[in-house]
Amino acid sequence: GITNINCSGHIWVEPATIFKMGMNISIYCQAAIKNCQPRKLHFYKNGIKERFQITRINKTTARLWYKNFLEPHASMYCTAECPKHFQETLICGKDISSGYPPDIPDEVTCVIYEYSGNMTCTWNAGKLTYIDTKYVVHVKSLETEEEQQYLTSSYINISTDSLQGGKKYLVWVQAANALGMEESKQLQIHLDDIVIPSAAVISRAETINATVPKTIIYWDSQTTIEKVSCEMRYKATTNQTWNVKEFDTNFTYVQQSEFYLEPNIKYVFQVRCQETGKRYWQPWSSLFFHKTPETVPQVTSKAFQHDTWNSGLTVASISTGHLTSDNRGDIG
């Protein structure tokens, strides 16, 4: 960056190089160039010469003043006009940053995705800080009182093998940057209660042409958890409102769920599961689209109806969606 250049003098910022966004700041430049009494001192921001709010303080020093500085990052340097020099002489440069102190981290959540071998902890970091902000995740065993700390810049994956202090823990998050530090409330967890079953996936759909056509959705999960509850939500793609069906599920075989849907309409389906009665749900699965067939026109010929019935006409779909929806709808 600009801070690596060789200086002939120095540049400094008041109140600091990293400051709260929206503050008034002063950038000072002091020349120390051999055989040069600067005629003029110039300031550059991101390579562009500043023309206003520059005050000469003395023979070697000038000040640039900014009101309500809102840029997250800027590279500043200053130059001198020396007598007998055709070009400006570089004095020094500095990278400056503005931003905000961190908000108190909230909505701290820790879950263990089945088979992952990790406890994943996330939180709502609050508003964007614009400056480098680090998070320390504290995990304290309620049985041994031992505390571990993990440094991260976003979420954290903690190997369950490293959680040797029993099943019950307190987890909290400290957020810190150059402008301040905040700490979340403590979350109490029990490792047995935060396991989220292996993802449920809709594999295919078919509409069977019976007297009343019905759509069968096939879905499965590789979970080994015995008591699993699931929700499947579905709607016409033109509709705003989801319909939700609930299931107590045994994943020893592929699930088949039946729906009586309107003909010739494109529907979207999603599924999610949880260990029955626990707090946390899987995120909703990828969007699965299925278009129901048009109604088979009524025909008077019994023979034709009989043939149609026997043909077991089906319309099948496979998953095409890759969008996922978060697990915060209905808390999750």
Epitope: Q274, T276, G277, R279
Partner: antibody, heavy 117, light 107 residues
Framework: QVQLKESGPGLVQPSQSLSITCTVS????????VHWVRQSPGKGLEWLGV???????DYNAAFISRLSISKDNSKSQVFFKMNSLQADDTAIYYC???????????WGQGTTLTVSS | DIKMTQSPATLSVTPGDSVSLFCRAS??????LHWYQQKSHESPRLLIK???QSISGIPSRFSGSGSGTDFTLSINSVETEDFGMYFC?????????FGGGTKLEIK
Amino acid sequence: QVQLKESGPGLVQPSQSLSITCTVSGFSLTSYGVHWVRQSPGKGLEWLGVIWSGVSTDYNAAFISRLSISKDNSKSQVFFKMNSLQADDTAIYYCARSRGSYYFDYWGQGTTLTVSS
Amino acid sequence: DIKMTQSPATLSVTPGDSVSLFCRASQSISNNLHWYQQKSHESPRLLIKYASQSISGIPSRFSGSGSGTDFTLSINSVETEDFGMYFCQQSNSWPLTFGGGTKLEIK
């Protein structure tokens, strides 16, 4: 059939604590969460907290410092304790069942609490 | 916290009338909205889940609609047993919160 029944003291003095037991039948506490909700003329229905099918709990932040919920799965009982009661804690206290989705499909009949000296 | 506002506070109707009760959330809650009925001196009873899903054992004259912030509970041809309080509840974020209720009374 599914039933939840609260039993509480009826009258508690200010600054004292409240203990209510919710005894359930027709379902297992290892498969359902049990929530506590109170109802008063001044504040309407307020969600207080929940104990999930494991041992984890969640509390309304407004009550977290003085509330604790626990249970005994073998006795099908959930225990609610609230400390430092004041007159505005006077209400009907309900326990209610949820399956993991956060609505209440069965409620107890409620126990009326008056906080008064 | 998400604030749930119900309107009207009181609704006076004659048996046989069809009515609509309204619930508004202070921010979008998708369809994570549930309706309860509470008769005098009784505990609440779940009527509708997820804004529009019917509940086993609840008469078909009760229906729900809405998504986002605005929701409606409709009662098609009110019967005498329907009079009482109606509450909505959001389950989109902690803490779970209820509306202040609508009292359905006989005109």
